[in-house]
Interface confidence: low
């Protein structure tokens, strides 16, 4: 494909998430709780998520031989989610990375939420056309992912407090993922 433009739509995707969901994994629900924010007086059960960026992408789709006649517009979900207690840090507050629980086994990732299916026409070099049915992303959300214990997590502690948005979140595959992987 060819990316013509990617515009940051970021507008605080704020989604309440249950503090203690079922431990059983289901198609639309990731496992267990969010990363705990330790050493603060803030409520650990507060799990409103912020900071999930939605990027608006305009691109042409190609299957190798044929290219879309008109560009496809969709959202791209950027990979950061921050629990509410980190927000002061993210907007320039004084919290540092040391407040992240070293032992927590939960992580967050910004993933696809809502999608829609559409048909797109591709023009081929020999003059013929092909029609594909694809699913494009229309909204993003924060998704919880439980990693197995004993994974390396030293990078969380080594990041600079000056750039708190850099707390990376591991991810659990969203069940409503984009059904075309051209991007």
């Amino acid at each position: 494909f060819k990316n013509d433009a990617t515009e940051i739509l970021y507008s605080h995707v704020v989604k309440p998430v249950p503090a203690h969901p079922s431990s059983n994994s289901t198609l639309n629900q990731a496992r267990n709780g969010g990363r705990h924010f330790s050493n603060t007086g803030l409520d650990r059960n507060t799990r409103v998520q912020v900071g999930c960026r939605e990027l608006r992408s305009t691109k042409y789709i190609s299957d190798g031989q044929c290219t879309s006649i008109s560009p496809l517009k969709e959202l791209v979900c950027a990979g950061e989610c921050l629990p509410l207690p980190v927000l002061p840090n993210w907007i320039g507050g004084g919290y540092g990375t040391k407040y992240w629980s070293r032992r927590s086994s939960q992580e967050w990732r910004c993933v696809n939420d809502k999608t829609r299916t559409q048909r797109i026409q591709l023009q081929c070099q020999d003059g013929s056309t092909r029609t594909y049915k694809i699913t494009v992303v229309t909204a993003c959300k924060c998704k919880r992912y439980t990693r197995q214990h004993n994974e390396s997590s030293h990078n969380f502690e080594s990041m600079s407090p000056a750039k708190p948005v850099q707390h990376h979140r591991e991810r659990k595959r969203a069940s409503k993922s984009s059904k075309h992987s051209m991007s």
């Epitope: 494909f1 990316n3 990617t6 994994s25 289901t26 198609l27 990027l55 791209v76 950027a78 990979g79 950061e80 990732r109 993933v111 696809n112 439980t146 990693r147 197995q148 994974e151 390396s152 990078n155 969380f156 990041m159 948005v165 850099q166 707390h167 990376h168 979140r169 591991e170 991810r171 659990k172 595959r173 969203a174 069940s175 993922s177 984009s178 992987s181 991007s183």
Partner: antibody, heavy 118, light 107 residues
């Protein structure tokens, strides 16, 4: 079109380190996950770890923790995988792979053969 | 870690045959299972992701199904270019793991 181009083959001594590069083109590098996967001769695929290019956040397979370091340089759209304390069993083709939406590997580099031999 | 066991280890089939490769996970991974084809001397190529979704540009004769612990890759109408080693891979939990591979060749 997304492309991942890796550095050339390396021959290393046991105990030394190797650093393999993976230059990405097409797409937005900063919002991608780059994983490293290795394949010993005649063997299967083994995931080593990934980096989220936009932040430098990493996660490693615990089998390699302490020996592998994955980094990224946004200015050149290049990811790196450094493996230290090499031993003969680290002889393998090392692939970088760009993840799709969440944990499947949509695009792959051509592979870099690392041979560890005394 | 989650173990993935593929079967058969290898198989030979004729052009036009329907071929099924299975992948069993050591614990439930929902639909977080992907399939790749690796040809000799080449990098793997994504065929199917999320258990049943075809990657763009992959021929329609490739399909996938399954949920939980048991998954299948089906090739409906084997073609000569389908030879190679097929791998399943789970992305349900870290570390991501692959099956040991199934080698497919033409009779």
């Amino acid at each position: 079109q997304v492309q991942l181009v890796q550095s050339g083959a390396e021959v290393k001594k046991p105990g030394s380190s190797v650093k393999v590069s993976c230059k990405a083109s097409g797409g937005t590098f900063s919002s991608t996950y780059i994983s490293w996967v290795r394949q010993a001769p005649g063997q299967g695929l083994e995931w080593m770890g990934w980096i989220y290019a936009g932040t430098g956040g990493t996660r490693y397979n615990r089998k390699f923790t302490g020996r592998v370091t994955i980094t990224a340089d946004e200015s050149t759209s290049t990811a790196y995988m450094e493996l230290s304390s090499l031993r003969s069993e680290d002889t393998a083709v090392y692939y970088c792979a760009r993840e799709g939406v969440d944990g499947w590997f949509t695009y792959w580099g051509q592979g870099t053969l690392v041979t560890v031999s005394s | 870690d989650i173990q993935l066991t593929q079967s058969p280890f290898s198989l030979s089939a004729s052009v036009g045959d329907r071929v099924t490769i299975t992948c069993r996970a050591s614990q439930s991974i929902n639909d977080n299972l992907n399939w790749y084809l690796q040809k000799p001397g080449k990098a793997p190529k994504l065929l199917i992701f999320a258990a049943s979704t075809s990657q763009s540009g992959v021929p329609s004769r490739f399909s996938g199904n399954g949920f939980g612990t048991d998954f299948s890759l089906i090739i409906s109408g084997l073609q000569p270019e389908d030879v190679g080693t097929y791998y399943c891979q789970q992305n349900d939990s870290m570390p991501f793991t692959f099956g040991q591979g199934t080698r497919l060749d033409i009779k």
